[in-house]
């Protein structure tokens, strides 16, 4: 099982609560409340307060506002004030601003393009495998298998719209029922949230920035996972999504609409199509068991083709087998008839880099994967650097206030819903939730947007991507219209249901708390971010897939004990936080477990040893490489060429904040180990610079 952070011997104080509406910045208690933490996990902790379960506070005493890692950083404006500049200085400043804006838009453009190419790369590397996942006949009877296939396929092709369109074509070809398709759509929803999590990994250089960015990205993951955790069993039991969408589809007489407008693609396509063009039909054909498609390349070679309906002559056993009696003859040896065929003639080759290389898909995919990740990383670093230089002083204050401030009382509650609409609208404009949430991630990292505000924007993005799908469904041909519309509506109502579960009531906003917890852990142990990514998006789905293939009995045999252990741990945590006296002394904390089962420290040591040999070598290659090194090895002093990994570790070691009692079962991932650190110094701007 995955390790979890240290859980100290905390004694809760049930008489005192710190109340505060979730979603606001926590108010800081007195500085006098702070106590220094020692390395001894057995040591009792003083001044402990228990917070109610709906608080977004974690297992530590609230530090002062300055020390709260979740407080947005103040970006000091070190430059000369506008009023103090001379005319020449003002002109220079103006052109600098214009230059920065152009650079920002340029890097943003290549950032979006690299996301598109990253998706193509994933499709080339794993698209055919993704297609084969769909051709598994067990999907029909096993919703859990459908779910993990949805996750795996979307992760492999880096596009929920691709996996959804495969599902649509399978449903309209009667290879899949709508009932069997719903779990796949749920899985696709989860799979699409990996993109912005990968983008967050690029901000690994600065701890506090990484904490915010990673939490901001994983809030999407947790929302999707939690929604599935609740809604999949509900759907299996009641089929409410299937029933509601069926009623909608049957009650309206839809006419085929126009194609969903390609707004962002219009700008990015001219560039991305020069890099690579894919024939996405191949994945769908593989999913539909087309044997010929397995040998086809996904790389599009011919862009201009002439399709001519013609009659070809085919041999038949005898003239009795003729398609048309008048179109039948013999040449004395064979019997012939005419058959109508669509003849495709290649006219012009595509104009992209790989058109004449004739490389295998895996090779092209690997090249593009590496290049797109490098461009993605480089663009992100530059975006963060430019934003960091632009968003200082007054500008930052205005933007932060505009984005993060609520409406005046009594309409404060409406702000989040407006953010949902903004998220949906922006996603509709860019035609991709991945692009929108990925663009949001660095803004969360540098502290322009709070996680509390990013959460509704992300939820809106989930809605936005489904409205795009609904429009695309309305534009689909007659035979696919019904099924594609029903699936798009299932996707829409699934997201609506998820929002109703995890947004309206502040204490149900578990994704925020869980993401913050994960952000804290990942900021301290940066390798854990990669570990999380691999576990949640690959290992768990692949394990479930493997067990499902082995049959129901094996899945239940392994799954039930695992689920039982998880429930047991959660119940134990709940009791430890609410009524520890009910439990035997030994079970009142986690100290009865070996250290490796309750702390990440021993795992960290293993990872550090394992990656130690790469530290010196990789750090001096390049700064992008150094970031990758920081992510894997958490190396505090290895980067002598670029200072991107120096994080004032010593300063952090001795300034940990005391642990609170674990108050809720849902923040199992949150601990003093993960949170006990001072955010990285503001002066260390090298971390976000190249």
């Amino acid at each position: 099982m995955a390790p979890w952070p240290e859980l100290g011997d905390a004694q809760p104080n049930p008489d005192k609560y710190l109340e505060g509406a979730a979603g606001q910045q926590p108010t800081a208690p007195d500085k006098s409340k702070e106590t220094n933490k020692t390395d001894n996990t057995e040591a009792p902790v003083t001044k402990i307060e228990l917070l109610p379960s709906y608080s977004t506070a974690t297992l530590i005493d609230e530090p002062t506002e300055v020390d709260d890692p979740w407080n947005l950083p103040t970006l000091q404006d070190s430059g000369i004030k506008w009023s103090e500049r001379d005319t020449k200085g003002k002109i220079l400043c103006f052109f600098q601003g214009i230059g920065r804006l152009i650079l920002l838009l340029g890097f943003l453009y290549f950032f979006v393009c690299s996301l598109d190419i990253l998706s193509s790369a994933f499709q080339l590397v794993g698209g055919k495998m993704a297609g084969q996942f769909f051709s598994n006949s067990s999907i029909m009877s096993n919703p859990l298998l459908g779910l993990v296939i949805g996750v795996l396929v979307t992760v492999l092709v880096q596009s929920s719209s691709t996996s959804t369109s495969i599902v649509v074509s399978m449903v309209s070809s009667s290879l899949l029922t709508v009932r069997a398709a719903i779990p796949i759509i749920m899985g696709a929803n989860i799979g699409t949230s990996i993109t912005n999590t990968i983008v967050a990994l690029m901000q690994v250089g600065d701890r506090s920035e990484f904490r915010r960015a990673f939490a901001g990205a994983t809030v999407h993951d947790f929302f999707n996972w939690l929604s599935v955790l609740v809604l999949l069993p509900v759907e299996v039991a009641t089929h409410y999504l299937e029933i509601i969408t069926q009623l909608i589809v049957e009650s309206f007489h839809f006419k085929n609409g126009e194609d969903a407008p390609d707004l962002l693609k219009v700008i990015t396509k001219p560039f991305t199509k020069l890099i690579v063009q894919l024939d996405k039909k191949v994945i769908s054909q593989i999913a539909m068991n087309d044997e010929k498609a397995k040998n086809k390349s996904l790389v599009k070679i011919w862009c201009k083709t002439f399709t001519n309906k013609t009659q070809i002559n085919v041999t038949v056993p005898s003239t009795a087998n003729c398609t048309s009696p008048s179109l039948c003859w013999t040449d004395g040896i064979q019997n012939w008839t005419m058959k109508n065929v669509t003849y495709k003639e290649n006219i012009a080759k595509c104009q992209h880099i790989f058109v004449n290389f004739h490389l295998p898909d895996l090779a092209v995919g690997t090249i593009l994967l590496i290049l797109s990740l490098l461009v993605l990383c480089g663009c992100l670093i530059m975006i963060v650097k430019i934003l960091g230089s632009v968003l200082k002083g007054q500008v930052a204050t205005v933007i932060k206030k505009t984005i993060n401030t609520d409406f005046p009382f009594p309409f404060a509650w409406l702000t989040g819903y407006l953010a949902i609409l903004v998220g949906a609208g922006m996603t509709f404009i860019v035609q991709s939730s991945s692009v929108f949430t990925s663009a949001l991630t660095p803004l969360i990292g540098i502290g322009v947007i709070t996680i509390e505000r990013a959460y509704p924007l992300t939820l809106g993005s989930n809605i936005g991507t489904t409205t795009t799908a609904i429009l695309a469904a309305l534009a689909s041909p007659g035979n696919a219209l019904r099924s594609s519309l029903q699936i798009a509506l299932c996707h829409f109502f699934f997201n609506i249901s998820g929002i109703l579960l995890w947004y309206p009531i502040p204490f149900t906003r578990l994704p925020i708390r869980m993401a913050k917890g994960l952000g804290n852990i990942s900021a301290k142990y940066r390798w854990f971010a990669v570990f999380y990514l691999i576990i949640f998006f690959f290992l768990i789905p692949l394990t479930v897939f493997g067990l499902s293939l082995a049959g129901w009995r094996v899945l239940v045999g392994v799954g039930v004990p695992v689920v039982f252990i998880i429930i047991l741990v959660l119940c134990l945590r709940l009791l430890q936080s609410r009524c520890p006296r009910v439990l035997p002394k030994k079970l009142q904390n986690w100290n009865f477990l070996p250290l490796w089962m309750r702390s990440l420290k021993p795992w960290d040591a293993v990872v550090s040893k394992f990656t130690g040999c790469f530290q010196m070598r990789c750090c001096c290659c390049c700064r992008v490489c150094c970031r990758a090194c920081c992510l894997l090895c958490d190396c505090p002093k290895c980067c002598r060429c670029s200072k991107c990994c120096e994080d004032l570790e010593e300063a952090q070691e001795g300034q940990d904040v005391p642990v609170k009692a674990p108050e809720t079962f849902d923040n199992i991932t949150i601990s003093r180990e993960a949170q006990g650190e001072v955010p990285a110094s503001d002066s260390k701007t090298e971390c976000t610079a190249l």
Partner: antibody
């Protein structure tokens, strides 16, 4: 230009065999079927059989089966028709003709004919 | 085997006259009929295939029509060089069979 050149006239004894050749030029031999048609003096045309040179698939008219063998040599673009157990009624002009494979254009080009006389 | 019956077996007419030769199949052959011209002492030459399609280089005065069992070859204006024997052939089913021929002469 398209040409089908046949071998010279033959005089044969009853019971013997005759092998007539047909050399093709001016077209892709393998893209066509080579048919053999005979015409007895003052009579109509009678189809004997044919061959697809690129795969050596043959077909013969029922009343010639067992007596006629049609072969083709791709390397020399030549088709052969061998008729065994010759009888006096086999006296005829033997023509080779080409037919475009997989096409319904019929026998669009013929050889000049080979006269085979069977007499004791 | 499908029998192809041609009529008349011979005809004599003047230059410029319209000549019609008919061919009847013993069973439905669709449009799988060809017409050949054989001049005295020469090998046959393809005129019409697929009942009505003129072969390359064949003069426009030659035309074919019909489907099923009844087929016609028409020479709209007979020329001296058209003196020959004309054969119809079906290629609907194997074996390929020819008509008995129609001998065309000029008066």
């Amino acid at each position: 230009q398209v040409q089908l050149v046949q071998s010279g006239a033959e005089v044969k004894k009853p019971g013997s065999s005759v092998k007539v050749s047909c050399k093709a030029s001016g077209f892709f031999f393998t893209e066509y079927i080579i048919h053999w048609v005979r015409q007895a003096p003052g009579q109509g045309l009678e189809w004997m059989g044919g061959i697809i040179p690129n795969n050596d698939v043959t077909n013969y008219k029922q009343n010639f089966r067992g007596r006629v063998t049609i072969t083709a040599d791709e390397s020399t673009s030549t088709a052969y028709m061998e008729l065994s157990s010759l009888r006096s009624e086999d006296t005829a002009v033997y023509y080779c003709a080409r037919w475009r494979n997989a096409y319904y254009s019929a026998m669009d080009s013929w050889g000049q004919g080979t006269t085979v006389t069977v007499s004791s | 085997d499908i029998q192809m019956t041609q009529s008349p077996s011979s005809l004599s007419t003047s230059v410029g006259d319209r000549v019609t030769i008919t061919c009847t199949a013993s069973q439905d052959v669709g449009t799988a009929v060809a017409w050949y011209q054989q001049k005295p002492g020469k090998s046959p030459k393809l005129l019409i295939y697929w009942a009505s399609t003129r072969h390359t280089g064949v003069p426009e005065r030659f035309s074919g029509s019909g489907s099923g069992t009844d087929f016609t070859l028409t020479i709209s204006s007979l020329q001296p060089e058209d003196v020959a024997t004309y054969f119809c052939q079906q290629y609907r089913t194997s074996p390929l069979t020819f008509g008995g021929g129609t001998k065309v002469e000029i008066k």
